[in-house]
């Protein structure tokens, strides 16, 4: 819809703005559900949602420094089927534990180039950036 | 770790990085599996993700101009128990479709207050919002 | 000025484990992230894992089940433990810093090496 | 998982020639470092986010490439210069860092 343009800081650039950017609290992204005590195919009765889940995942960090948000989270299924809601345990053949994927917005820090080819700070340029978000018991697909 | 600094365009500003930043294409973040068919409480044997899965859900659009990324996209489940993997109809009261939720890392459009205190372009605020991903089968709770 | 410094105990049993210790001075541990590193006798370098400033770990895929990598951020000590070592475990083992900053970009060259410290697994 | 395939894995040079070895990867890379191991002696890095010289890295050596072809360069080759030469990318996920298996540089 709109365009908004790539930035970069200039030296004389108002200090209280390069403030109010790094105070805003943002911690690392560490979904509630990041648990990696829940690395089996199991389904279990109480924790976070990725491990009550009858598609149960695990998460792994995605970290670099020169993107925003710099910590992202990629899903991983611990179970190629999903699991019996009766025991939590025994795999069901009839359904899938399938990766549900989003390409997500994401800015990367870029060196900027001034009219004279210097340096000038850095410019943000805008990705999309494929994530897995969590996995999800489907029914297979039945090829017509 | 790091600090990034918000930032705003200034005039004398090379005009290949805003053609840079507004020629990145990025299509509306359409989800594959956006479909607004599947509104029924029923598990698809075909289509998207979101309509074969056994805790199905639609997605509604979350759209603003002044925000980065503009159109963000919020399920919204279709059934409060899981189908069934044998009928892909009935529900089965034994699992829950429940939320999985995000705080996804969001960019604003804010006024820039130069020194004088005189509008300067845009700033970019960095906030944590929350968005729900998906719908996921899991076991219900037993509290101890 | 930056250094780092490997030690450990040179010769380890088959089967049983492997502890190193990376002492640095010049820099602090929370501002930047320290890899492992080994090198067989004439062989290339294998990355082994790394720890970065707030403590988050990654490892080597192959070898993640028998790799633990922990710190001491007030002692400047960066900690390798390895379990049930193999005579192909023998090699150098390096701890190097990683994750610089130029101003614009952040950089995960490894920068800074120690002088290894070489473990042989023999009984 | 990214490989990186250095070659020729051996070359040898005489003093003031030009050198050039290469290091392709399996898929596109974006980040790539070398480093240069002299016998007996830890690596050195020499290139850092091609193309840019590490600190008090003689002039004559140049990183160059993109995607999943890179090269380094040494303008002319110095007795000094006799070493083994690592490439080695950083991805964030899955989180890695390969090195390459190395080129031996021989000075004749």
């Known amino acids: 819809y709109s365009h908004w343009p790539s930035c970069c800081p200039s030296k004389g650039y108002p200090s209280e703005e390069l403030l109010r950017w790094s105070t805003v609290p943002v911690p690392p992204l560490k979904p509630a559900s990041l648990d990696f005590h829940s690395v089996s195919c199991r389904a279990s009765e109480d924790g976070p949602l990725n491990s009550r889940a009858i598609s149960p995942w695990r998460y792994e960090l995605d970290r670099d420094l020169n993107r925003l948000p710099q910590d992202l989270y990629h899903a991983r299924c611990l179970c190629p089927h999903c699991v019996s809601l009766q025991t939590g345990s025994h795999m069901d053949p009839r359904g899938n534990s399938e990766l549900l994927y989003h390409n997500q917005t994401v800015f990367y820090r870029r060196p900027c180039h001034g009219k004279k080819g210097n340096h000038k700070g850095y410019c943000l340029e805008r990705r999309l950036y494929r994530v897995s978000l969590a996995c999800v018991c489907v029914r297979p697909r039945v090829m017509g | 770790y790091s600090h990034w600094p918000s930032c705003c365009p200034s005039k004398g500003y090379p005009s290949e990085e805003l053609l840079r930043w507004s020629t990145v294409p990025v299509p509306p973040l359409k989800p594959a599996s956006l479909d607004f068919h599947s509104v029924s409480c029923r598990a698809s044997e075909d289509g998207p993700l979101n309509s074969r899965a056994i805790s199905p859900w639609r997605y509604e659009l979350d759209r603003d101009l002044n925000r980065l990324p503009q159109d963000l996209y919020h399920a919204r489940c279709l059934c409060p128990h899981c189908v069934s993997l044998q009928t892909g109809s009935h529900m089965d009261p034994r699992g829950n479709s429940e939320l999985l939720y995000h705080n996804q890392t969001v960019f604003y459009r804010r006024p820039c207050h130069g020194k004088k205190g005189n509008h300067k372009g845009y700033c970019l605020e960095r906030r944590l919002y929350r968005v729900s991903l998906a719908c996921v089968c899991v076991r219900p709770r037993v509290m101890g | 000025q930056v250094q780092l410094k490997e030690s450990g105990p040179g010769l380890v049993a088959p089967s049983q484990s492997l502890s190193i210790t990376c002492t640095v001075s010049g820099f602090s541990l929370t501002d930047y992230g320290i890899n492992w590193v080994r090198q067989p006798p004439g062989k290339g370098l294998e990355w082994l894992g790394m720890?970065?400033?707030?403590?988050?770990?990654h490892y080597n895929s192959v070898l993640k089940s028998r790799l633990s990598i922990s710190k001491d951020n007030s002692m400047s000590q960066i900690f390798l433990k390895m379990n049930s070592l193999q005579t192909d475990d023998t090699a150098r083992y390096y701890c190097a810093r990683t994750l610089f900053y130029d101003g614009t970009l952040y950089y995960y060259a490894m920068d800074y090496w120690g002088q290894g410290t070489s473990v042989t697994v023999s009984s | 998982q990214i490989v990186l395939t250095q070659s020729p894995a051996t070359m040898s040079a005489s003093p003031g020639e030009k050198v050039t070895m290469t290091c392709s990867a399996s898929s596109s890379v974006t980040y790539m470092y070398w480093y240069q191991q002299k016998t007996g002696s830890s690596p050195r890095l020499l290139i850092y986010?091609?193309?840019n010289l590490a600190s008090g890295v003689p002039v004559r050596f140049s990183g160059s490439g993109s995607g999943t072809s890179y090269s380094l360069t040494i303008s002319r080759v110095e007795a000094e210069d006799a070493a083994t030469y690592y490439c080695?990318?950083?991805?964030?996920?899955?989180?890695?860092?390969?090195f390459g298996g190395g080129t031996k540089l021989e000075i004749k």
């Open positions: 720890i970065w400033g707030d403590g988050v770990t």
């Open positions: 986010d091609t193309p």
């Open positions: 080695q990318q950083w991805s964030s996920y899955p989180h890695t860092w390969t």
